[in-house]
């Protein structure tokens, strides 16, 4: 059984389509390992060296290239999604120097809600996206990005902050989710897995992708992040899945080629400005959207998540570089830096396109679509 392919998608050159590429056995959760599949490793599982290798008026238009995936999320085979954990599964690590609970890490103790109570909130991120249950919202218009094509100077700070690799963005990158929903980009960072283990934060029908990019934005209604935290729509994140394709992605290479310089936790380097929009899929019109939270402590809610339907393709070597270069706390590899998917708790994920409508009629199991709350806007 497959999720339907949307006929209006124009095929892109390059990468293999998930349509002809069913999920392998390792992606199918079994009874005994489904909690582990959904849960980042505990302290005892943290990978070490021995395991290797192994957030304008019109959208900027860029030509469809071999660097973008032809796979669309609705093309994925249907896989039974693991049940959402009833309690947040993420843990932080008690700092060895004392009881400071704010020194969170992926894996270990204490639980994140002890680090920040908001992490036990009801509307957390990431989530599992089930396209057939998404509410089609025609009011969700194509995203508008302005000023994302940066000149080489001034250079940008690329930092290994111990949890991810983060690129700090300069003022002037404007993004609109729709009329009156305007934001400024602040930074971008990535989440990834390890050799042979995918590391995206969001999942689709239980399928985890190799990696995920987050571009974090602040609403123009606020001057500073601390004012916006926890306020509905105060922050917005554009998220895209990264997948393996046959070609090197030249946009990502501008960052990945510099990772060795920041291998050590806390280190940073300066990189020339680049086209930030080239790190995202080219199709700004097809996406999923829901209200959630930051995926790391303090896990503040009210964050508008926009997850692109189209994926971005990187070469196998590039994905390996991403997951195998950086070091995190305590002389451990910076890997598997993703949070477990969180329960929707009644939230409805909206889609800007009819993601849950099959292009060919089915004899059985008619799809029940959720209604769009924003349809009248």
């Amino acid at each position: 059984q497959r999720l339907p392919r949307m006929q209006e998608d124009s095929p892109l050159g390059g990468g293999s389509s998930g349509e002809d590429d069913p999920l392998g056995e390792e992606d199918l959760p079994s009874e005994e390992d489904s909690p582990r599949e959904e849960d980042p490793p505990g302290e005892e599982d943290l990978p070490g060296e021995e395991d290797l290798p192994g957030e304008e008026d019109l959208p900027e238009v860029k030509p469809k290239s071999e660097e973008e995936g032809s796979l669309k999320l609705e093309d994925l085979p249907t896989v039974e999604a693991p049940g959402d954990p009833q309690e947040p599964q993420n843990n932080a690590h008690r700092d060895k120097e004392g009881d400071d609970q704010s020194h969170w890490r992926y894996g270990g103790d204490p639980p994140w809600p002890r680090v920040s109570p908001a992490c036990a909130g009801r509307f957390q991120s990431p989530v599992d996206i089930r396209p057939q249950l998404a509410a089609f919202c025609p009011a969700l218009r194509p995203l508008e990005l302005l000023g994302f094509q940066l000149p080489p100077l001034p250079e940008l700070r690329l930092r290994n902050n111990g949890h991810s690799v983060q690129l700090t963005l300069p003022p002037g990158l404007e993004m609109a989710l729709g009329p009156g929903r305007e934001y400024r980009a602040l930074q971008l960072h990535l989440h990834w897995g390890a050799a042979g283990r995918p590391g995206s934060e969001h999942t689709v029908e239980g399928h985890r992708f190799p990696a995920e990019i987050h571009v974090v934005h602040l609403s123009t209604a606020f001057a500073r992040v601390d004012e916006a935290l926890g306020r509905p729509g105060g922050l917005a994140v554009l998220a895209a899945f990264l997948e393996e394709g046959p070609e090197e992605n030249s946009a990502y290479e501008q960052l990945l080629s510099r990772l060795e310089e920041i291998a050590e936790e806390g280190s940073e380097t300066q990189v020339p400005g680049l086209d930030i929009s080239a790190l995202l899929p080219s199709d700004f019109s097809r996406y999923f959207q829901y209200e959630g939270s930051l995926t790391t402590p303090p896990c503040a809610q009210g964050v508008i998540w926009t997850v692109f339907n189209q994926t971005v393709m990187l070469s196998a070597k590039q994905l390996h570089t991403l997951s195998d270069t950086l070091w995190g706390p305590g002389d451990s590899r910076l890997q598997l830096n993703f949070r477990a998917t969180q329960p929707l708790n009644g939230r409805v994920i909206e889609a800007s396109f009819p993601a849950g409508v099959d292009s060919s009629p089915r004899a059985a199991e008619p799809v029940q679509l959720n209604s769009c709350l924003a349809a009248g806007d």
């Epitope: 704010s102 949890h163 930074q187 500073r224 601390d226 806390g266």
Partner: nanobody, 117 residues
Framework: EVQLLESGGGLVQPGGSLRLSCAAS???????????MSWYRQAPGKGLELVAV???????KYSDSVKGRFTISRDNSKNTLYLQMNSLRAEDTAVYYC????????WGQGTQVTVSS
């Protein structure tokens, strides 16, 4: 709104020591604990130079020019960042700025450190 206030700068002789502090205040959601904290400095006529970083996990990183002489630390319970500077040299003379990196950069106003005999 979050404010960072540096203190502890001053005039010191070569070989002497100073301890800089950076106190964070004013934030309703305590982002200090979740920010990578840094000390930068700017010498007269020069650009901004990263001196030291401490991540949320307590990991530290120093510029080569201060390694072994300076120590960065943080006390999240007091929302305070520190920089212990020993064996000070004339070339350490600069305005020292505290930085909190949490989704965006927050900066202090700076504190002057002058190393001179």
């Amino acid at each position: 709104e979050v404010q960072l206030l540096e203190s502890g700068g001053g005039l010191v002789q070569p070989g002497g020591s100073l301890r800089l502090s950076c106190a964070a205040s004013g934030n309703s959601v305590n982002i200090f604990s979740f920010a990578a904290m840094s000390w930068y400095r700017q010498a007269p006529g020069k650009g901004l130079e990263l001196v030291a970083v401490i991540t949320t996990t307590g990991g530290t990183k120093y510029s080569d020019s201060v390694k072994g002489r300076f120590t960065i630390s943080r006390d999240n319970s007091k929302n305070t960042l520190y920089l212990q500077m020993n064996s000070l040299r004339a070339e350490d003379t600069a305005v020292y700025y505290c930085n909190a990196d949490y989704l965006q950069d927050y900066w202090g106003q700076g504190t002057q450190v002058t190393v001179s005999s």
